[in-house]
Amino acid sequence: KESCDVQLYIKRQSEHSILAGDPFELECPVKYCANRPHVTWCKLNGTTCVKLEDRQTSWKEEKNISFFILHFEPVLPNDNGSYRCSANFQSNLIESHSTTLYVTDVKSASERPSKDEMASRPWLLYR
């Protein structure tokens, strides 16, 4: 008989090497039975995990598993670090292993900004 506990299938010490400026999806594989749990992402800062409140997330449902996705539009150098997803299920908090993003910044900070960047700097966003 299959367990009906919520399970988060992030492998221990999983990591992703990605380029700054590209889109990226960080997936938290979630197994549940009847009711989909409330899942959140957080980023590790020392011993605490800071909840990512204002970030785009979405659910992708597949036959035997669901994915809670954290979207990066785009990946930025300061997205480098370790992330964890956690699920609230029947008053229990279930935490995943952490997964680490290694962000390579191909456009070094010493590079001269492009005309687009200079023209639009007042409206440039950062996180």
Epitope: L19, D22, Q56, K107, S114, D116, E117, S120, L124, L125
Partner: antibody, heavy 125, light 108 residues
Amino acid sequence: EVQLVQSGGGLVHPGGSLRLSCAGSGFTFSSYAMHWVRQAPGKGLEWVSVIGPGGGTYYADSVKGRFTISRDNAKNSLYLQMNSLRAEDMAVYFCARGYYYGSGNFFKNYGMDVWGQGTTVTVSS
Amino acid sequence: EIVLTQSPGTLSLSPGERATLSCRASQSVSSSYLAWYQQKPGQAPRLLIYGASSRATGIPDRFSGSGSGTDFTLTISRLEPEDFAVYYCQQYGGSPYTFGQGTKLQIK
């Protein structure tokens, strides 16, 4: 003037291949994510694929494994290689400019703010 | 994926009237990543609103966007003859970058 000019549509048999091109001008092409969006006759808009400034890609499930998005920043060009074409791929295909990534942690994401004129892909036996 | 549902499917109004178009998401969308487009027959879509409420360059101030979470609205305060077209909402916060099915705004 900021613009995207498309080429490469046409008639192809089911199972055939086609390559679409999109040339950008008037902006720093290499700093922008680029998208392909399609519109079947009389239907709404459907997102197809995206490629980031660094070459990272994502695809709609309906085209995954059959379509390949690529870019040549030296030529300010975006491409969509379409293989194993099906009747349901018949549509007008648009290229569109996505978010801007500068350097460090600066970016701007205004959605798809510049569009090509569209090119028609007809799949018929 | 995030499904966007637009209503009404067709809206019949006269020039000078106010148009209110709705877009509802199946999952929460960060308001930073909700856009509205206008499309006329035989033309490419044109960006009107990004970030749920910011007007794109060159868009007249009769167009405004609002909303957050799962409910978003595009309002055209006083319809001009050139505003009759199809309007699409889109979430662009991540793949797949879904569009609503469109609202056709037609002359009454």
